[in-house]
């Protein structure tokens, strides 16, 4: 019996009945065994077929078989109801081998020419399966010459049987207080040969509750408990299960914060699996009762571990833990069923006793000593000598705990000294130097420090003076002895003030003329204003209208008198303003250098002389009455003049203060 070609020889060829194309003889039996490479099959078809026809091909036949299975028994020329001829059919081996047997019996009624067939090896497409047959691969099948291989979708791994896809379903940890988990692919059939482990791990103090929902379908057995596929639930206390079948298991209250769910499947079956909805509970905390004038948020039926609430106070009430203020309050429920902090109080906001107002007072409007939310107080300044700046003095205790003005200011109002008050009224005619009376020049300041000089009080802690008068002390401000509130130069009864800093105009050059002869002294403490100590006003923009030529100004000081000595008593003189050109001309002749009188100066005095300020008066104020406000203001600062005070044809020269208002304001606001 010819074996036919065997792999690895090329597998293709021709088979024919003995004597073909002639008739075949009786009592012939011929067998061919064809073998293809692994992963290949054999294909066979007939180009000629002419055998004796007999019932069930009992006489002459060609039999095709593959392994133990007979693929076909062929005879005749064309198929009948009970016999089969190959016709144009192609036959395929089931594996890689094909057996062909030709047999003729002892006689033929007429001559038959037999058969001719061709064969070849071809690749098996293992991925193609007949309807109703199990697929070659669980997920993806990939054919190639001589074989195939399987692969899996994401989330699966190929089992060692190389065909089944096992789910990668272990290591999932659920940490939320509730959630859902299910068998892989639920509600579609779960994968075979898989072992799934799910963990629920909550914070200590929580207890996990498991509810099986929707449907439950895990392969079972009528007699043995879950031998194929099963679901098990394990806690640190006990094990639940195994579960299988089609009945939803009952709720499981685990009384544990950690749960492990194991699901194991075998290689067969087609079941939809399971779905679990889990929740958690914990020991509830006492229900939080809001303090009076406060409310709890959020409002819940119960509060368990990790739940929290906050307390919010009504407007005008504040959170207090004892005496200590809190901006916010949140308490968290702990595992032992207690809150992590005690309930605060919502106490009415108390702004506390209002601060004392320097040179002023405060009055309780709502009631004596009432300082709580919405209480009203009224600040006022000491009459006559102080006035309230910008503010109406009415303050309300607001919800933020601050006394707040009607303009929303939280700072105290300011009692500013009233400026320019004097006991003296101007007479309108010029008369000789006279002794000042108490309250005539309450802004007058005596400056001692090397030489005698003067100044004028501004506000309650600044002194305006001439730069040349304090130049030597500019780096040693504390050396200046500043006295006020007295008429007598040598009197022991005066108000003492000390300098904190001296500010000399940056345009002033010592010993090189008197341009910009102006300075400010900052006092280290505020002085108390009274009838004998009152600041002078600075000139308003409109002040020039009271300082025209021939308008009367008043100079005061303890400077040299006609007798050539410093005055013991404060003296003053009323003098007219001199035309600027006239004054400039008076100081253009020798010994005065050209340009001595600048636009920053004004001149005052009599052409005939006799009325003038003199050495020792330097830095003092030349003041004018503002007839609109009825207040005195400083128009000039005693600066320089002729060597002989009160000389005819010469005039006293004063620093023109109105030119320096921005400089004064800048220094005072900056320091």
């Amino acid at each position: 019996t010819p074996l036919g070609p065997k792999w690895p020889e090329p597998v293709f060829g021709r088979l024919a009945s003995p004597g073909f194309p002639g008739e075949y003889a009786n009592d012939q039996e011929r067998r061919w065994t064809l073998t293809a490479p692994p992963g290949y099959r054999l294909r066979l078809y007939f180009t000629h077929f002419d055998l004796e026809l007999s019932h069930l091909c009992e006489y002459d036949f060609v039999k095709l078989s593959s392994g133990a299975k007979v693929l076909a028994t062929l005879c005749g020329q064309e198929s009948t109801d009970t016999e089969r001829a190959p016709g144009k059919d192609t036959f395929y081996s089931l594996g890689s081998s094909l057996d062909i047997t030709f047999r003729s019996d002892y006689s033929n009624e007429k001559p038959f020419t037999g058969f001719e067939a061709f064969y070849a090896a071809e690749d098996i497409d293992e991925c193609q399966v007949a309807p109703g047959e199990a697929p070659t691969c669980d997920h993806h099948c990939h054919n190639h010459l001589g074989g195939f291989y399987c692969s899996c979708r994401a989330g699966y791994v190929l089992h060692r049987n190389k065909r089944t896809c096992s789910a990668l379903c272990s290591g999932q940890v659920f940490t939320q207080r509730s959630g859902e988990l299910s068998s892989p692919e639920y509600p579609r059939p779960y994968p075979k040969l898989s072992s799934c482990t799910y963990s629920i791990s909550l914070e200590e103090g929580f207890s996990v509750i498991l509810d099986f929902v929707e449907s439950f379908d895990v392969e079972t057995h009528p007699e043995t408990l879950c031998p194929y596929d099963f679901l098990k639930i394990q806690t640190d206390r006990e094990e639940h299960g195994p579960f299988c079948g089609k009945t939803l298991p009952h709720r499981i209250e685990t009384k544990s914060n950690t749960v492990t769910i194991t699901f194991v499947t075998d290689e067969s079956g087609d079941h939809t699996g399971w779905k679990i909805h889990y929740t958690s509970t914990a020991q509830p905390c006492p229900y939080p009762m809001a303090p009076p004038n406060g409310h709890v948020s959020p409002v819940q039926a119960k509060y368990i571990l990790k739940d929290s609430f906050s307390i919010f106070c009504e407007t005008g009430y504040e959170l207090l833990q004892g005496h200590l203020p809190l901006k916010s309050f949140t308490a968290v429920c702990q595992k032992d069923g207690s809150w992590d902090r005690p309930m605060p109080a919502c106490s009415i906001v108390d702004c506390g006793p209002p601060d004392d107002l320097p040179s002023g007072r405060v009055e309780y409007i709502t009631g004596p000593g009432v300082t709580t939310y919405k209480a009203v107080i009224q600040y006022s300044c000491e009459e006559t000598f102080y006035t309230m700046k910008v503010n109406d003095g009415k303050y309300v205790c607001e919800a933020d705990g601050f006394w707040t003005s009607s303009k929303g200011e939280k700072s105290l109002p300011v009692c500013e000294p009233v400026c320019g008050l004097s006991a003296r009224t101007t007479g309108g005619r010029i008369y000789g130097g006279q002794k000042a009376k108490p309250g005539d020049f309450p802004w007058q300041v005596l400056i001692l420090g090397g030489t005698t000089a003067a100044g004028a009080l501004l506000y309650d802690n600044w002194v305006l003076t001439a730069a040349h008068a304090v130049y030597e002390q500019k780096h040693d401000a504390s050396a200046l002895d500043i006295r006020m509130g007295t008429l007598k130069r040598l009197s022991p009864h005066y108000t003492q003030a000390w300098s904190e800093a001296v500010f000399i105009h940056e345009g002033y050059t010592h010993d090189a003329g008197f341009d910009n002869d102006i300075a400010l002294i900052k006092l280290n403490n505020k002085v108390v204003i009274n009838s004998n100590i009152t600041p002078i006003c600075l000139p308003r923009k409109e002040a020039e209208s009271f300082m025209r030529t021939d308008d009367i100004g008043t100079a005061s000081g303890w400077g040299l008198t006609q007798r050539g000595f410093l005055a013991r008593n404060l003296m003053y003189v009323d003098i007219p303003i001199v035309d600027h050109q006239k004054c400039t001309a008076a100081y253009e002749k020798p010994p005065y250098p050209r340009g001595s009188v600048t636009a920053n100066m004004l001149c005052a005095g009599l052409e005939s002389g006799g009325k003038d300020s003199c050495r020792g008066d330097s830095g003092g104020a030349l003041v004018f009455l503002d007839s609109e406000t009825e207040r005195w203001f400083v128009g000039g600062i005693v600066s320089w003049g002729s060597m002989n005070c009160g000389e005819a044809g010469q005039y006293g020269v004063y620093t023109k203060v109105i030119n320096y208002i921005p400089w004064i304001e800048n220094i005072i606001s900056d320091f």
Partner: antibody, heavy 114, light 107 residues
């Protein structure tokens, strides 16, 4: 991590003003709580000086109220203590603390001596 | 001002002992009392607030109780690191005040 750190001169002359600053890191002083100054004379107990709250309100021990000022600089996350007209009795370790007292500075010794 | 009177002012105990320190307020302070531990040259360390609430990180051997005027700090089993001075403190009423301290020494 909330941290408080006191700073300032360790020696102050009598009648002068004691000035200390507490620098806070890890928490904004305007977010919440009361920010306190507490002192402890050598070998003695603790004395509360006062606080400035998250909103800037102050509260002082009445025994020191006339001499004490607590202020803050929110841009630097600092609060400060000024105690005027000091005497030898003000010699102490000065602590800053956040209340509920959960965070304290390490303290700074201030000696009042000429 | 509210006086916080601590007793005893000092005590000697051994490792493993149960130690109780009491603090009496001169008037009702609710539960607004704190306890501090202080070691030489160190800042006070907070232990208890609101009479019975432990600060985080404080060992469970420390416990506080009381309300109104009578308060107690208990150390259930004294450890070597617990030898220190303990202060009570009321923050219920202005001005805030402290107890005079209790020194716990090794017997």
């Amino acid at each position: 991590q909330v941290q408080l750190q006191e700073s300032g001169p360790g020696l102050v002359k009598p009648s002068q003003t004691l000035s200390l600053t507490c620098t806070v890191s890890g928490y904004s002083i305007t977010s919440d709580y009361a920010w306190n100054w507490i002192r402890q004379p050598p070998g003695k107990g603790l004395e509360w000086i006062g606080y400035i709250s998250y909103s800037g309100r102050t509260s002082y021990n009445p025994s020191l109220k006339s001499r004490v000022t607590i202020s803050r600089d929110t841009s630097k996350n600092q609060f400060s203590l000024k105690l005027s007209s000091v005497t030898a009795a003000d010699t102490a370790v000065y602590y800053c603390a956040r209340y509920w007292g959960d965070y304290w500075g390490q303290g700074t010794l201030v000696t009042v001596s000429s | 001002d509210i006086q916080m009177t601590q007793s005893p002012s000092s005590l000697s105990a051994s490792v493993g002992d149960r130690v109780t320190i009491t603090c009496k307020a001169s008037q009702n302070v609710g539960s607004n009392v704190a306890w501090f531990q202080q070691k030489p040259g160190k800042a006070p360390k907070p232990l208890i607030y609101s009479a019975s609430y432990r600060y985080s990180g404080v060992p469970s051997r420390f416990s506080g109780s009381g309300s109104g005027t009578d308060f107690t700090l208990t150390i259930s089993s004294l450890q070597p690191e617990d030898f220190a001075t303990y202060f009570c403190h009321q923050y219920n009423t202005y001005p805030l005040t402290f107890g005079g301290g209790t020194k716990v020494e090794i017997k």
